[in-house]
């Protein structure tokens, strides 16, 4: 009797179990009672990444420099091209179809994690004892100056945006 289900890496067509095409190849002709499935390799700019019965290969992703993209990994007949962003930019989404500049951490915030080609800068509020007085994509919160180690006293308290101001100790006469 004709099969109703086929083995792994096969597909059912016209009551025949035909072999799927291997990754990197597309279907040219279904098998028959007398012939195997016929497959052809994808061209240089195309790929198929699974066992398949596709009659067309997929185009490799284009890393458009106008969108801030560059090639991270060149595609093969079995894999798509992987794009990443130019220096100072990161992907807008998981599919990385375009890039945006890294976010800067405002004064009062420091960089917790520096941005990569695929992730934005992560900022954190400067805790007590630390400050940041610049807007930066790479500077962490810095500790307040320790006046004591310089034999000075705090003349003006620090904030999350400003350092302490040290001054000479008042000498009792």
């Amino acid at each position: 009797e004709p099969p109703t289900a086929c083995r792994e890496k096969q597909y059912l067509i016209n009551s025949q179990c035909c072999s799927l095409c291997q990754p990197g190849q597309k279907l040219v002709s279904d098998c028959t009672e007398f012939t195997e499935t016929e497959c052809l390799p994808c061209s240089e700019s195309e790929f198929l990444d699974t066992w398949n019965r596709e009659t067309r290969c997929h185009q490799h992703k284009y890393c458009d420099p106008n969108l801030g993209l560059r090639v991270q990994q060149k595609g093969t007949s079995e894999t798509d091209t992987i794009c990443t962003c130019e220096e100072g930019l990161h992907c807008m989404s998981e599919s990385c179809e375009s890039c945006v500049p890294h976010r800067s951490c405002l004064p009062g915030f420091g960089v917790k994690q520096i941005a990569t080609g695929v992730s934005d800068t992560i900022c954190e509020p400067c805790p007590v004892g630390f400050f940041s007085n610049v807007s930066s994509a790479f500077e962490k919160c810095r500790p307040w100056t320790s006046c004591e180690t310089k034999d000075l006293v705090v003349q003006q308290a620090g904030t999350n945006k400003t350092d302490v101001v040290c001054g000479p100790q008042d000498r009792q006469r």
């Epitope: 002709s29 098998c31 028959t32 009672e33 007398f34 012939t35 195997e36």
Partner: antibody
Framework: QVQLQESGPGLVKPSDTLSLTCAVS?????????WNWIRQPPGNKLEWMGY???????NYNPSLKNRITISVDTSKNQFSLKLSSVTAVDTAVYYC?????WGQGTLVTVSS | DVVLTQSPLSLPVTLGQPASISCRSS???????????LNWFQQRPGQSPRLLIY???NRFSGVPDRFSGSGSGTDFTLKISRVEAEDVGVYFC?????????FGSGTKLEIK
């Protein structure tokens, strides 16, 4: 229903070229199957001569050397056989076949 | 070329009795994908060959279930479980794993 029908002269002179056509109905000749020519001399076993594929490429029996040509006319959904320099040993019933479906066969006699 | 040797050449059978035909190949008919393209045909007197079994053991549509095929590698068998009057004719095996495709010499089944 797939049907194949051979046509061509039943008598060919020695050294001439035998020409037969196979009209296919009920199925497009441009899809997956191979389209074969097979012959059967009187009271003898079947001999595969060659096939033409859906894409126009073909394969021939080496025993027929350079005498055989199989071509396809997709606009008429038919394929043809040419066998040159025939002799009496080429006398046979000639079948066109998809292998699961066959024509009824046509007897070609090579004689002067 | 692959040589297919059929036996017996002639097979007299009583109606309702089983029949068995052997086809031996000069080399393995299993291809690199694990498929074996060995087929069985029936040719009734004055008719074209008719496909019975493809890929060793698959009955073609419309073929009665008294016909079955088995075997692997180089050794294949066609069995008829209970012979009927309409089964009279010549039975051929055909391999399409290797080019050129080749037929067995045929087994003539007749009623005793």
């Amino acid at each position: 229903q797939v049907q194949l029908q051979e046509s061509g002269p039943g008598l060919v002179k020695p050294s001439d070229t035998l020409s037969l056509t196979c009209a296919v109905s009920g199925y497009s000749i441009t899809t997956n199957y191979y389209w074969n020519w097979i012959r059967q001399p009187p009271g003898n076993k079947l001999e595969w001569m060659g096939y033409i594929k859906y894409d126009g490429s073909n394969n021939y029996n080496p025993s027929l050397k350079n005498r055989i040509t199989i071509s396809v006319d997709t606009s008429k959904n038919q394929f043809s056989l040419k066998l040159s320099s025939v002799t009496a040993v080429d006398t046979a019933v000639y079948y066109c076949a998809r292998l699961d479906y066959w024509g009824q066969g046509t007897l070609v006699t090579v004689s002067s | 070329d692959v040589v297919l040797t059929q036996s017996p050449l002639s097979l007299p059978v009583t109606l309702g009795q089983p029949a068995s035909i052997s086809c031996r190949s000069s080399q393995s008919l299993e291809n690199s994908n694990g498929n074996t393209f060995l087929n069985w045909f029936q040719q009734r007197p004055g008719q074209s060959p008719r496909l019975l079994i493809y890929k060793v053991s698959n009955r073609f549509s419309g073929v009665p279930d008294r016909f079955s095929g088995s075997g692997s590698g180089t050794d294949f068998t066609l069995k008829i479980s209970r012979v009927e009057a309409e089964d009279v004719g010549v039975y051929f095996c055909l391999q399409v794993t290797h080019v050129p495709f080749t037929f067995g010499s045929g087994t003539k089944l007749e009623i005793k």
